[in-house]
C-alpha cells in the first residue's frame, strides 16, 4: 500500500506519539491542526526522536514535504546556533539534533521562514516560505503514560483496533497513549472494549486484564451485558461497565455519568461524583462553581496581534492604529494603502471562515464601536508561572533537556511567545487565573497623564465605548480575569523591545472533533486592571473628537476630555505576581454597574520583535513558551516612547483614538 495514502498514521513510544497527516496545508494551518488535536507540530530534538520520525515517514517520494515545528521570523538569522535562529513552535531553541539539507549560508534572511522535512531519503530539513501548502505535516502528542499494545490471543478474530485520543484508528501501534481505546473481536462472535486508564497503584494500564477471548459462559450474547460479561466461579455471569460508565439498575446496561452531568463545556467520566468537568482552551473553571467556565484573555498572547488586540468571550480581534490597515493574515498592520481592502476581505472569507454567520460578527463588532485606549505604555514581560492551561496531550520532554541558558539572552531577540502548555491528565482545564507580570522602564516625568476610556450612561449600542472597568465587588471571583500588574525597572527605553507574554486563544473551529463539542458563547466580559496611578495625576477619560492642547513633541496623544473619576485602591486577593521590581498596589477605576456597556473589550498594544535585544533575565529561566506562528508583516511604527509620570505611574497611552481596521475572530487563529 502506498505510504502516502490519504490516511494519517502514527508511531507512539511510552511518552509521546508522532503522527503524519498527508494533507496539503500551509505552516499556519498545519500548526493549528496539530493544536486542535491537543498536540503541536513535531519537534524532533534528539537522534532517538528523529529515528521515530524516520520510521513513521518511511520512504516517500522526493517531491513530498512535511511541516515540522520550526519557524524563524524575518531578520532573526543566528547561523552559529544549531537551529540557525529558528525556534521550535514550543517556544525554545534547544535541540540535540539537526538535519539541515545544506550548510548555513551567510544570507541576510529578510523574510519569515519555516522548515519542512523531505519525505524521501534522509528526511533532511529544508527551509522555505511558510505560505506554501506542502504535502503534509507531522504532529507530536505528549502524554503522561502509555499502555503497551495488547498481545494477540488464540481466540481473537483479528488484531485489536486502537483509537487514540487524537482520533487515529489503527492496528499498528506498539504503545497506546493514555485515553486510547482498544477494540478486540473474538472468534466466538463477541468482543471486548478496553480503555488505557490510570491505575490505582499509579501509572497507566488497560482497564481490563486478559484473557479477553476465552470461555463460553457469556456466549452467545455476551451474557446480555452491554459492555463486559464476567463468568463467576459458580457458572453464572455478571456484567461490568468499562471505565467511565456505571452499571444501570437493570444490572446489564451501562450509563454514562456525563449524560446527566451539569458541565457547561466538557465532561470526563470518573472522580467522586462519577464525572468531572473541564473547560475548553480559552476558558477556565469558575472558582465558585467548577461546572461553569469563564473566559481567559487571549490578548495576553505575545504577537497575537501586531498592534492592538481586543479580547472577548472565547476569542479575540486584532486592530490597527489610524493610518494603518490590517494585512490579510489578520494580525499584521501595514501603512494604509499597502494592500487592497478587498484582499483583506477575500482572505477573511477564504482563510478565516469558521462557519459563523457574518451578521453575528457584525453584531459583535457593533458592541465595540467608538474610542478606546491602548493598554498604557509598553510592557516588558518576565516569565511567570504559566497558567495551568492543561491539555491531556502535548509534546513533553525530559526535564534535563529544558534550556539551561537564561531566556532571552542579550544577543537573542525574544520570539513572540506564550506560556508553554503544561501537561495534565484532564482533557482541557484551566485551574488558576492568569497572572502576567511586567516591568516598565523608568522614564522622565510625565507630560501626559494616564488615559482611560469613559463610561457613558445610556449610550445606544452603536455608540458604546469600551471601558476599563474595576473588579466588580458584587460579582463572584470567577468573573475576575487575570491581573496585569506593571512595575518599573531602571532600564533606558531605547534598548527594550516591547514584549507581551500571553496565552493561547481558543482553537476550535467549526469542524470540531468529537473530543471537543461545539459550544457557542455570546457576550463579552473583560476587565482591565490598571497599575498604580499616583494621586497627583488625574486620569483622563477619552471621548471621541474632543480636543487636547498640544503635548510634548515626542508624545503621541489621544483626543481626550479631562474628567475626574474617583480612584479607589483595592487589594487583589490571592494573587502572586512575580517581578524583580517592587509592585505598586493596583489602583482601579470604580465604574457604576448601570453605566457599563454590554461589551468591554481590552485593548493591548502588541509589538513583534525585530532585530532588537532584551536585557531581561527571567524569574523562571527554564520556563518556555509556545512560539506562535504568524506571517510576517511590516514592523509597526506605532511604538513611540512616551514619558512616564512617576516611578509608579501607569504608562501613558499610545496611538491614535481612531480605528483603522480590525479583524473579527472568535475561535479562529491568525
Amino acid at each position: 500500500q502506498d505510504p502516502w495514502a490519504a490516511e494519517p498514521r502514527a508511531a507512539c513510544g511510552p511518552s509521546s506519539c508522532y503522527a503524519l497527516f498527508p494533507r496539503r496545508r500551509t505552516f499556519l494551518e498545519a500548526w493549528r491542526a496539530c493544536r486542535e488535536l491537543g498536540g503541536d507540530l513535531a519537534t524532533p530534538r534528539t537522534p532517538e526522536e528523529a529515528q521515530r520520525v524516520d520510521s513513521l515517514v518511511g520512504a516517500g517520494p522526493a517531491s513530498r514535504l512535511l511541516w515540522i515545528g520550526l519557524q524563524r521570523q524575518a531578520r532573526q538569522c543566528q547561523l552559529q546556533r544549531p537551529l540557525r535562529g529558528f525556534t521550535w513552535t514550543t517556544g525554545d531553541q534547544d535541540t540535540a539534533f539537526t538535519n539541515w539539507a545544506q550548510p548555513a549560508s551567510g544570507g541576510p534572511c529578510p523574510a519569515q521562514r519555516c522548515v519542512a522535512l523531505e519525505a524521501s531519503g534522509e528526511h533532511r530539513w529544508l527551509e522555505g516560505s511558510c505560505t506554501l501548502a506542502v504535502d503534509g505535516y507531522l504532529c507530536q502528542f505528549g502524554f503522561e503514560g502509555a499502555c503497551p499494545a495488547l498481545q494477540d490471543e488464540a481466540g481473537q478474530a483479528g488484531p485489536a483496533v486502537y483509537t487514540t485520543p487524537f482520533h487515529l484508528v489503527s492496528t499498528e501501534f506498539e504503545w497506546l497513549p493514555f485515553g486510547s481505546v482498544a477494540a478486540v473481536q473474538c472468534q466466538a462472535g463477541r468482543g471486548a472494549s478496553l480503555l488505557c486508564v490510570k491505575q490505582p497503584e499509579g501509572g497507566v494500564g488497560w482497564s481490563r486484564a486478559g484473557p479477553l477471548c476465552l470461555g463460553t459462559g457469556c456466549s452467545p450474547d455476551n451474557g446480555g451485558c452491554e459492555h463486559e460479561c464476567v463468568e463467576e466461579v459458580d457458572g453464572h455471569v455478571s456484567c461490568r461497565c468499562t471505565e467511565g460508565f456505571r452499571l444501570a439498575a437493570d444490572g446489564r446496561s451501562c450509563e454514562d455519568p456525563c449524560a446527566q452531568a451539569p458541565c457547561e463545556q466538557q465532561c470526563e467520566p470518573g472522580g467522586p461524583q462519577g464525572y468531572s468537568c473541564h473547560c475548553r482552551l480559552g476558558f477556565r473553571p469558575a472558582e465558585d462553581d467548577p461546572h461553569r467556565c469563564v473566559d481567559t484573555d487571549e490578548c495576553q498572547i505575545a504577537g497575537v496581534c501586531q498592534q492592538m488586540c481586543v479580547n472577548y468571550v472565547g476569542g479575540f480581534e486584532c486592530y490597527c492604529s489610524e493610518g494603518h490597515e490590517l494585512e490579510a493574515d489578520g494580525i499584521s498592520c501595514s501603512p494604509a494603502g499597502a494592500m487592497g481592502a478587498q484582499a483583506s476581505q477575500d482572505l477573511g472569507d477564504e482563510l478565516l471562515d469558521d462557519g459563523e454567520d457574518e451578521e453575528d460578527e457584525d453584531e459583535a463588532w457593533k458592541a465595540f464601536n467608538g474610542g478606546w485606549t491602548e493598554m498604557p505604555g509598553i510592557l516588558w514581560m518576565e516569565p511567570t508561572q504559566p497558567p495551568d492551561f492543561a491539555l491531556a496531550y502535548r509534546p513533553s520532554f525530559p526535564e534535563d533537556r529544558e534550556p539551561q541558558i537564561p531566556y532571552p539572552e542579550p544577543t537573542w531577540p525574544p520570539p513572540l511567545s506564550a506560556p508553554r502548555v503544561p501537561y495534565h491528565s484532564s482533557v482541557l482545564s484551566v485551574t488558576r487565573p492568569v497572572v502576567v507580570s511586567a516591568t516598565h522602564p523608568t522614564l522622565p516625568s510625565a507630560h501626559q497623564p494616564p488615559v482611560i476610556p469613559a463610561t457613558h450612561p445610556a449610550l445606544s449600542r452603536d455608540h458604546q465605548i469600551p471601558v476599563i472597568a474595576a473588579n466588580y465587588p458584587d460579582l463572584p471571583s470567577a468573573y475576575q480575569p487575570g491581573i496585569l500588574s506593571v512595575s518599573h525597572s531602571a532600564q533606558p527605553p531605547a534598548h527594550q523591545p516591547p514584549m507581551i507574554s500571553t496565552k493561547y486563544p481558543e482553537l476550535f473551529p467549526a469542524h470540531q472533533s468529537p473530543m471537543f463539542p461545539d459550544t457557542r458563547v455570546a457576550g463579552t466580559q473583560t476587565t482591565t486592571h490598571l497599575p498604580g496611578i499616583p494621586p497627583n495625576h488625574a486620569p483622563l477619560v477619552t471621548t471621541l473628537g474632543a480636543q487636547l492642547p498640544p503635548q510634548a513633541p515626542d508624545a503621541l496623544v489621544l483626543r481626550t476630555q479631562a474628567t475626574q473619576l474617583p480612584i479607589i485602591p483595592t487589594a487583589q486577593p490571592s494573587l502572586t505576581t512575580t517581578s524583580r521590581s517592587p509592585v505598586s498596589p493596583a489602583h482601579q477605576i470604580s465604574v457604576p454597574a448601570a453605566t457599563q456597556p454590554a461589551a468591554l473589550p481590552t485593548l493591548l498594544p502588541s509589538q513583534s520583535p525585530t532585530n532588537q535585544t532584551s536585557p531581561i533575565s527571567p524569574t523562571h529561566p527554564h520556563s518556555k513558551a509556545p512560539q506562535i506562528p504568524r506571517e510576517d508583516g511590516p514592523s509597526p511604527k506605532l511604538a513611540l516612547w512616551l514619558p512616564s509620570p512617576a516611578p509608579t505611574a501607569a504608562p501613558t497611552a499610545l496611538g491614535e483614538a481612531g480605528l483603522a481596521e480590525h479583524s473579527q475572530r472568535d475561535d479562529r487563529w491568525l
Epitope: Q112, E118, S129, T131, L132, A133
Partner: antibody, heavy 124, light 108 residues
Framework: QVQLQESGPGLVRPSQTLSLTCTAS????????IHWVKQPPGRGLEWIGY????????TYNQKFKGQATLTVVKSSNTAYLRLSSVTAEDTAVYYC?????????????????WGQGSLVTVSS | DIQMTQSPSSLSASVGDRVTITCRAS??????VAWLQQTPGKAPKLLIY???NRYTGVPSRFSGSGSGTDYTFTISSLQPEDIATYYC??????????FGQGTKVQIK
C-alpha cells in the same frame, strides 16, 4: 539533462477536444509535479493546473475545471492535457513545466524547467 | 484568487541602466514568488525563486527582493540579451498559481 517536450495537433476544430502530450526525460518522472500553462498569442501566461505523477493528484485553476483533464502515464514518462469543447479563445501556445522541489537547502515550488511550447490553433 | 499586479507594463532603457520592475500580490504570499524571463518565441525561464534567490546559472545582475505582498525585480546593468518580457508569479498553492501581466523590456 532535464528536458520537457510538448507535442500536439496544431489545428483543432471548434467544439472538439484538444489533446497535448508532454514527454519528460533526464530526471525521475514521479519525483516532480508537472504544470500546464496557456499563453494566447501576444498575451500573458495563465496557469491551467498541475498533476503529481507519483499519485495522480491533480489541482486545477477554477477557470479550467470541467474543461481541462490532466493525466500521466508513468511507464512512458508522459503527461497529457485534454481540453474539451474548444473555442477560438483556446488558441494559444501550451507549455508543460516541471515544479521544482528544492534548491540549495530551500524547498520551493517555482517552475524550474519548461517545454518549448506547442502552438494550437482552434479554427474551422 | 490571488492577483499579481505588475508594473510597468513596458519600459525602455539604455544598455547599462538599472531596471526595476515591481509586483504586488493581492494577499500575503510570503516569499512564494518567482520571476521569469521570456524572450520572443521562446519558453519562459526561471530567474528568481523564493522572492530573492537566484536560480542556478542566472547572472548576478538579476536580483529580487520582497515578502508578504510587495516584490521587486532588478536588473542592475541592462544588457542587450536582456530584451524580453518578465513575469512575476506566485505559487503558494492557495488556492492556485498566478502570473503578473508581464513587463516588456526594450533597449532605447
Amino acid at each position: 539533462q532535464v528536458q520537457l517536450q510538448e507535442s500536439g495537433p496544431g489545428l483543432v476544430r471548434p467544439s472538439q477536444t484538444l489533446s497535448l502530450t508532454c514527454t519528460a526525460s533526464g530526471y525521475t518522472f514521479t519525483d516532480y509535479v508537472i504544470h500546464w500553462v496557456k499563453q494566447p498569442p501576444g498575451r500573458g501566461l495563465e496557469w491551467i493546473g498541475y498533476i503529481n505523477p507519483y499519485d495522480d493528484d491533480t489541482t486545477y485553476n477554477q477557470k479550467f475545471k470541467g474543461q481541462a483533464t490532466l493525466t500521466v502515464v508513468k511507464s512512458s514518462n508522459t503527461a497529457y492535457l485534454r481540453l474539451s469543447s474548444v473555442t477560438a479563445e483556446d488558441t494559444a501556445v501550451y507549455y508543460c513545466a516541471r515544479r521544482g522541489n528544492s534548491y540549495d537547502g530551500y524547498f520551493d515550488y517555482s517552475m524550474d524547467y519548461w517545454g518549448q511550447g506547442s502552438l494550437v490553433t482552434v479554427s474551422s | 484568487d490571488i492577483q499579481m499586479t505588475q508594473s510597468p507594463s513596458s519600459l525602455s532603457a539604455s544598455v547599462g541602466d538599472r531596471v526595476t520592475i515591481t509586483c504586488r500580490a493581492s494577499q500575503n504570499v510570503g516569499t512564494a514568488v518567482a520571476w521569469l524571463q521570456q524572450t520572443p518565441g521562446k519558453a519562459p525561464k526561471l530567474l528568481i525563486y523564493s522572492a530573492s534567490n537566484r536560480y542556478t546559472g542566472v547572472p548576478s545582475r538579476f536580483s529580487g527582493s520582497g515578502s508578504g505582498t510587495d516584490y521587486t525585480f532588478t536588473i542592475s546593468s541592462l544588457q542587450p540579451e536582456d530584451i524580453a518580457t518578465y513575469y512575476c508569479q506566485q505559487y503558494t498553492n492557495y488556492p492556485m498559481y498566478t502570473f503578473g501581466q508581464g513587463t516588456k523590456v526594450q533597449i532605447k
